[in-house]
Amino acid sequence: MMTGTIETTGNISAEKGGSIILQCHLSSTTAQVTQVNWEQQDQLLAICNADLGWHISPSFKDRVAPGPGLGLTLQSLTVNDTGEYFCIYHTYPDGTYTGRIFLEVLESSVAEHGARFQIP
């Protein structure tokens, strides 16, 4: 039975040209995290493998930095970066947990962080 929950940074906004940290945290489970995949729709951004380290997709290599922790830093944001991002935790023995973050990239300088929320 999967007992874990994923806490994410929820709905967030950031300024065009700036950077943002995407963070997820898996709690309430003793399952071992073997890998975390970061995706935007069907595009892979990065994978953090517990044994092998980070793999950043070549499409994002110049704009994505690993960390902090299992999170991901998106740099040089454009309005095209607006959309849903997913952290997919591969765990043993539980299986897969998915968290969702919605990022809005704003033209103006008024960019505030949204509230945290949890996905069971």
Partner: antibody, heavy 120, light 107 residues
Framework: EVQLQESGPGLAKPSQTPSLTCSVT????????WNWIRKFPGNKLEYMGY???????YYNPSLKSRISITRDTSKNQFYLQLNSVTTEDTATYYC??????????????WGQGTSVTVSS | DIVMTQSHKFMSTSVGDRVSITCRAS??????IAWYQQKPGQSPKLLIY???YRYTGVPDRFTGSGSGTDFTFTISGVQAEDLAVYYC?????????FGGGTKLEIK
């Protein structure tokens, strides 16, 4: 130029535990990760597992109770041991190198393969 | 495990033709796909990684595309030396898994 060369017993009897060796030249095994893959008669490829630059191992769960991957960095070799073989383990065994940071799970340097036939 | 399905075990083509090999994943694998070529008597060679990126030294007649569950590997202007078995592989999650292979035959 990196070269990988597999060697093994060629023939094994059912229930035996053959050991295969992959000798790496032109590159230090203390970087990247090092894989075993086998190809069955009829072209099916099966990923068996890896040993990482740090010595951490991953085994395909379908083989987990029977497989062991070890290394000797002083000899620049890594090894595959498969316990309790049956005729179903008859295959060509390949070792291959991966660079997770740049290529993820895509493996780009392969040995020529060594054939193992299990027969009584 | 993620199952990779290459629906054609064999494909026949002529020199100069364009040929496309398809691969379907049993669940979404984003763009974590590699394509390999295995010529008779040789070991597999990496051609494409991250679904669409050519590995170093791979001729530009080889291209890959797709994301999610459906992927295509295309050879534009097939040459006689392209006779081989072509495999897709996913590395979205462990264990990495391969398609069953598509054998390209040259008429």
């Amino acid at each position: 130029e990196v070269q990988l060369q597999e060697s093994g017993p060629g023939l094994a009897k059912p229930s035996q535990t053959p050991s295969l060796t992959c000798s790496v030249t032109g590159y230090s095994m203390t970087s990247d990760y090092w894989n075993w893959i086998r190809k069955f008669p009829g072209n099916k490829l099966e990923y068996m597992g890896y040993i990482s630059y740090s010595g951490r191992t991953y085994y395909n769960p379908s083989l987990k109770s029977r497989i062991s991957i070890t290394r000797d960095t002083s000899k620049n070799q890594f090894y595959l041991q498969l316990n309790s073989v049956t005729t179903e383990d008859t295959a060509t065994y390949y070792c291959a190198r991966g660079d997770y940071s740049n290529y993820g799970g895509a493996m780009y340097d392969w040995g020529q393969g060594t054939s193992v036939t299990v027969s009584s | 495990d993620i199952v990779m399905t290459q629906s054609h075990k064999f494909m026949s083509t002529s020199v100069g033709d364009r040929v496309s090999i398809t691969c379907r994943a049993s669940q979404g694998v984003s763009t974590t796909i590699a394509w390999y070529q295995q010529k008779p008597g040789q070991s597999p060679k990496l051609l494409i990684y991250s679904a669409s990126y050519r590995y170093t030294g791979v001729p530009d007649r080889f291209t890959g595309s797709g994301s999610g569950t459906d992927f295509t590997f295309t050879i534009s202007g097939v040459q006689a030396e392209d006779l081989a078995v072509y495999y897709c592989q996913q590395y979205y999650s462990s264990p990495f898994t391969f398609g069953g292979g598509t054998k390209l035959e040259i008429k």
